[in-house]
C-alpha cells in the first residue's frame, strides 16, 4: 500500500456514503514521506469495511427504511494517518464536484458538444475516520464542501467546537468524559502521585490536558507527564520507560491518555527493559479490551485498568463476518491481501498473491478461529445507520407522500442532511438510544475493565466497574484480591501526630518531609506549628494549647528538686 | 554502608539440591532496586542467572536456567536461590548482586563477595 | 536470546600504554552496555554503564564507546593496577556477559 496507487471498496446506489476506515497500519517513521502504509488490520479495518457493506445491505433490504431508495458506499483507506486520510478525501470531493458540475451541465467534451460520460455519484457524507488527529483533518476539508461526517470513535473534546467543526458529529461521548472517569478511579483508590503519558496528536494530547486539569482539581499530582507517537521507535519507548522508571517507587500509576499502540509500544519496551509488575497501566479507551494491544506481552500488562465505550457484541455481524470466504468475497478488495496475513499463507491464482509466506491456504481455514469482534463494532453499525435515519428523515420532510428520491433532494443539500441529521434519534444495535447533543455528540456510558492473569499463562480482560454520566461503581473485590494488594501510587507518606508538613522548592504538593513541632509548639494546620503562648503548653494530641496550672508554694511544702546537668 | 553477603554453598552430590542466600545489609528494598545471582566457574566468565523484583516479586530467568532455578524473596531483607538436578558443570561461585536502577535488565552495581558451590560425587 | 562476544581474549600492554577491549552484540542493544573489571579473587566493580558513563569513582582513563552491536573499551595511561579481566555486560531483551578479557600489564 504505497500513495501510487489505492484500491477502493465501491457499493452501487442512490446514494453514496463515503467511509474512510484504517484498513492498514499507519505508516512508519521511515516510511511516513512516501505514505506507505503497514500491514493490513483486521478488526479497525476488515471488519469495518464488512460492517459497512453488510448494514448497507440490511438497511437496504429494510422496508420502513428509505423505501424505494439504494444506500450505496465508497470505502477508502485511511491508514489511521492524516496525510493518507486528506489524499483519501480529495477523491471523495473530487468525485463531488464533478458530480455537481455535471448537474449543471458544466462538463463539456473539449471539442465543445456535451458529454455523455456519467461520472460517479457525489458522496452525501462519510462515516469516520477512527482516529481524532485524522478526523479533524478531514473535517476540515468536507466542512468547505458541506459534507456532512459521523464518527464512531474519534473522542477528541475539540470536536465538540462546532465554530470550527460544524459538519461533524460522533456516536460516541467527547473524551472530557472518560477523563473525569480515569481521574474517579484515580480518586477512589488514593492514588494522589500518579505519572502521565500520552499519544502525540488531538485524542491525546486534549485528553491528557483535561486528565490533567480534572487532577488539580482533586488535589492529585503529577510526576511528570509525557507525550510520544504510536509509530515511535523501540528507542522512543525505551527511554519514556527509564523516565517512568526514574519516578518510581513513589509514582506507580500511569495514566495513559494513549492510542492502543502506544500501549503496546510501552508494553513491548517494559519487556525490553525487564519492568513487568512494576507500573499499574491507567488505559484510557484507545486501549480499551484490545487483544492486539497485549498479544505476546500479557505478562507486561496485567493487573492494567482500562476505559472501553459501552458496546457489546453485534451477533448478526458475526454470523455474516464469520461466514466470508476469499474465493467467494470480491467485493472487499482487501479481503484476499488480510486471508493471506491472518493465516499467514498464499492464496494461490489471486491477483493479491504474496510470496512472502512459504505454504499454500488451506480450504478449510476459517474466520471462526481466534475470533474477536472489534470491540467498537456497534460505534460503525450506529453511525452508518445515523446517516440512513438522517436522509430517511429529510426525505420524509423534503418529499412528503413521496417513495423514492424526489427532485427536492437531487443534489442532495449537506446543510439540510446535517440539519436532519442532528435532530435524528432511534435505537441503536444495542437497544440504547442514539441521539446527539448540540455539539454533535453523544452521551457517555463507560465500562471499566481490568486486565488479569486467570490462570497459568492464560490472561484475559475481565469488567470490573462502570461510568455512567459521571457515576463510578468498581467491584474492588475483583481488582485487588485483598485491601492490601491496592497499589500506593503517593509521593509522600502522611505526617505522624505532632508533625507538619514541610514542601521542599519546586517540589509538587503531594511531596513533602515530615517535621516534628518543636516543644512549646502545637499543629495549627498541616503545614504550620504554632507556639503556645506564655503560660500554656500543648496539649497532649498537639492540636492546642492548654493553660498551665498556676500552682502557688507555701511554707509548708518540700523544697523543690533540682537537678544538675550532669546528673544521669 | 551497603553490604551483601550469600551463603548456603558447599558440596553437593549431582542431581542434589540446594538453596543459598544472599542477606542484604544498609539496603533499603523498597527502593526498588532488583536483586540477581550470578555465577562464576572457576576460571571462566560470568554467568547471569536470574533477578527478582522486590516490589512485584516477578522474576526473569536466563533461558538455560528456566526449571532447574528459582529465585524468591524471603523476607525484606534476604532472596534465596534454589537449585535443583545439579551437575559438575554447576560448580561455580555464585555471588548476589544488586541492579543499578529498577528493572531486571541493568548493569550490576553491588556485588557480594559469593559462595562456592562444589557439584562432585 | 542475548549473546555477547568479547576479544581479544588477551591482551598486554607496556606501563603508559594504551589497551582496547571490544565486544559484539548478537542483536541491536543500542546503548545498553557495561564493562565490569575483575581481579583475581575479588568481585567484579562496574567500570562504564550505558557505553559510556563512567562509574562513581572509576578513573576518567577508562572509556567505552560504541551503540547497536559493536562497543570497545579503552584504557589508556595504563597502570600496573589495571591488570584484570574485564568483561562486558549487554542489557537488554536479557543479561548476557561477554567471555572476558585478561588484561596484562607489562
Known amino acids: 500500500q504505497s500513495s501510487e496507487r489505492r484500491v477502493v471498496a465501491h457499493m452501487p446506489g442512490d446514494i453514496i456514503i463515503g467511509a474512510l476506515f484504517s484498513v492498514h497500519h499507519q505508516p512508519t517513521v521511515d516510511k511516513v514521506h512516501e505514505r506507505k502504509c503497514g500491514a493490513v488490520r483486521e478488526q479497525y479495518g476488515i471488519q469495518r469495511v464488512e460492517a459497512m457493506l453488510h448494514t448497507l445491505e440490511r438497511i437496504n433490504s429494510d422496508p420502513t427504511l428509505l423505501p424505494n431508495i439504494t444506500l450505496g458506499c465508497e470505502i477508502r483507506d485511511s491508514c489511521w494517518h492524516s496525510a493518507v486520510a486528506l489524499e483519501q478525501s480529495i477523491e471523495f470531493i473530487r468525485d463531488s464536484l464533478i458530480s455537481s458540475e455535471e448537474e449543471e451541465g458544466l462538463v463539456r467534451c473539449v471539442d465543445g458538444s456535451s458529454s455523455s460520460f456519467r461520472s460517479k455519484k457525489p458522496i452525501v457524507g462519510v462515516i469516520g475516520p477512527g482516529s481524532s488527529s485524522v478526523a479533524i483533518q478531514v473535517q476540515n476539508l468536507l466542512q468547505l464542501f458541506n459534507i456532512p461526517q459521523i464518527a464512531y470513535s474519534a473522542t477528541s473534546m475539540d470536536l465538540s467546537d462546532k465554530t470550527l467543526f460544524k459538519y461533524f458529529m460522533r456516536v460516541v461521548p467527547s473524551d472530557a468524559q472518560q477523563a473525569r472517569a480515569m481521574v474517579d478511579i484515580v480518586k477512589r483508590y488514593n492514588w494522589t502521585y500518579v505519572s502521565a503519558v500520552h499519544t502525540e496528536g488531538n485524542y491525546g494530547e486534549s485528553g491528557m490536558e483535561a486528565f490533567k486539569d480534572m487532577s488539580a482539581k482533586e488535589g492529585i499530582c503529577i510526576a511528570h507527564s509525557y507525550k510520544i507517537y504510536s509509530n515511535a521507535g523501540e528507542q522512543s519507548f525505551d527511554k519514556l520507560l527509564k523516565k517512568l522508571t526514574s519516578h518510581l517507587p513513589k509514582a506507580r500509576v500511569v495514566a495513559c491518555f494513549c492510542e492502543g499502540m502506544t500501549v503496546r509500544g510501552l508494553l513491548m519496551a517494559m519487556r525490553r527493559l525487564g519492568l513487568a509488575g512494576e507500573f499499574l497501566l491507567l488505559g484510557s479507551d484507545g486501549w480499551a479490551d484490545r487483544y492486539d494491544v497485549t498479544d505476546g506481552y500479557q505478562r507486561e500488562a496485567v493487573g492494567g485498568i482500562t476505559i472501553k465505550l459501552q458496546s457489546p457484541d453485534v451477533k448478526w455481524f458475526d454470523d455474516y463476518y464469520l461466514k466470508l470466504r476469499p474465493e467467494t468475497n470480491h467485493r472487499n478488495p482487501w479481503f484476499q491481501e488480510f486471508w493471506q496475513h491472518r493465516f499467514q499463507c498464499r492464496l494461490e491464482g489471486f491477483p493479491q498473491e504474496n510470496s512472502k509466506y512459504n505454504k499454500t491456504c488451506d480450504s478449510s481455514l476459517t474466520l471462526k478461529t481466534h475470533h474477536v469482534q472489534d470491540s467498537k463494532m456497534g460505534f460503525v453499525i450506529n453511525a452508518i445507520y445515523s446517516m440512513a435515519y438522517g436522509l430517511h428523515n429529510m426525505q420524509m420532510s423534503l418529499c412528503p407522500g413521496y417513495a423514492g428520491l424526489c427532485d427536492a433532494m437531487k443534489p442532495i443539500d449537506g446543510r439540510k442532511l446535517l440539519e436532519s441529521l442532528m435532530k435524528t434519534n432511534f435505537t441503536g444495535v444495542s437497544g440504547d438510544m442514539i441521539l446527539f447533543d448540540e455539539n454533535g455528540d453523544s452521551p457517555g456510558r463507560y465500562e471499566i475493565m481490568n486486565f488479569k492473569e486467570m490462570g497459568k499463562d492464560y490472561f484475559d480482560y475481565i469488567n470490573v466497574g462502570s461510568w455512567d454520566n459521571g457515576e463510578l461503581k468498581m467491584d474492588d473485590d475483583e481488582v485487588w484480591s485483598k485491601k492490601s494488594n491496592i497499589i500506593r501510587s503517593v509521593c509522600s507518606e502522611p505526617c505522624e501526630k505532632g508533625q507538619i508538613k514541610v514542601i521542599r522548592k519546586g517540589e509538587v504538593s503531594c511531596c513533602w518531609t515530615c517535621t516534628p513541632c518543636k516543644e512549646n509548639e502545637y499543629v495549627f494546620d498541616e503545614y504550620t506549628c504554632k507556639a503556645c503562648q506564655l503560660g500554656s503548653w500543648p496539649t497532649d494530641d498537639l492540636t492546642g494549647c492548654d493553660l498551665i496550672p498556676v500552682q502557688y508554694l507555701r511554707w509548708g511544702d518540700p523544697e523543690p528538686d533540682y537537678k544538675d546537668d550532669d546528673d544521669k | 554502608q551497603e553490604q551483601l553477603v550469600e551463603s548456603g554453598g558447599g558440596l553437593v552430590q549431582p542431581e542434589g539440591s540446594l538453596t543459598l542466600t544472599c542477606t542484604a545489609s544498609?539496603?533499603?528494598?523498597?527502593?526498588?532496586?532488583?536483586m540477581c545471582w550470578v555465577r562464576q566457574a572457576p576460571g571462566k566468565g560470568l554467568e547471569w542467572i536470574a533477578c527478582?523484583?522486590?516490589?512485584?516479586?516477578?522474576t526473569w530467568y536466563a533461558n538455560w536456567a528456566k526449571g532447574r532455578f528459582t529465585i524468591s524473596k524471603t523476607s525484606s531483607t534476604t532472596v534465596t536461590l534454589q537449585m535443583t538436578s545439579l551437575t559438575a558443570a554447576d560448580t561455580a561461585a555464585y555471588r548476589c548482586a544488586r541492579t543499578m536502577a529498577i528493572g531486571a535488565y541493568n548493569p550490576f552495581k553491588l556485588w557480594g563477595q559469593g559462595t562456592l558451590v562444589t557439584v562432585s560425587s | 536470546a542475548l549473546v555477547m562476544t568479547q576479544t581479544p581474549s588477551s591482551v598486554s600492554a607496556a606501563v603508559g600504554g594504551t589497551v582496547t577491549i571490544n565486544c559484539q552484540a548478537s542483536?541491536?542493544?543500542?546503548?545498553?552496555l557495561a564493562w565490569y573489571q575483575q581481579k583475581p579473587g575479588q568481585r567484579p566493580k562496574l567500570l562504564i554503564y550505558?557505553?559510556?558513563d563512567l562509574a562513581s569513582g572509576v578513573s576518567s582513563r577508562v572509556k567505552g564507546s560504541g551503540s547497536g552491536t559493536e562497543f570497545t573499551l579503552t584504557i589508556s595511561d595504563l597502570e600496573c593496577a589495571d591488570a584484570a579481566t574485564y568483561y562486558c555486560q549487554g542489557y537488554y531483551s536479557g543479561n548476557a556477559f561477554g567471555g572476558g578479557t585478561e588484561v596484562v600489564v607489562k
Open positions: 542483536q541491536n542493544i543500542y546503548s545498553n
Open positions: 544498609g539496603i533499603d528494598f523498597s527502593s526498588g532496586y532488583f
Open positions: 527478582i523484583s522486590p516490589y512485584s516479586d516477578n
Open positions: 550505558d557505553a559510556s
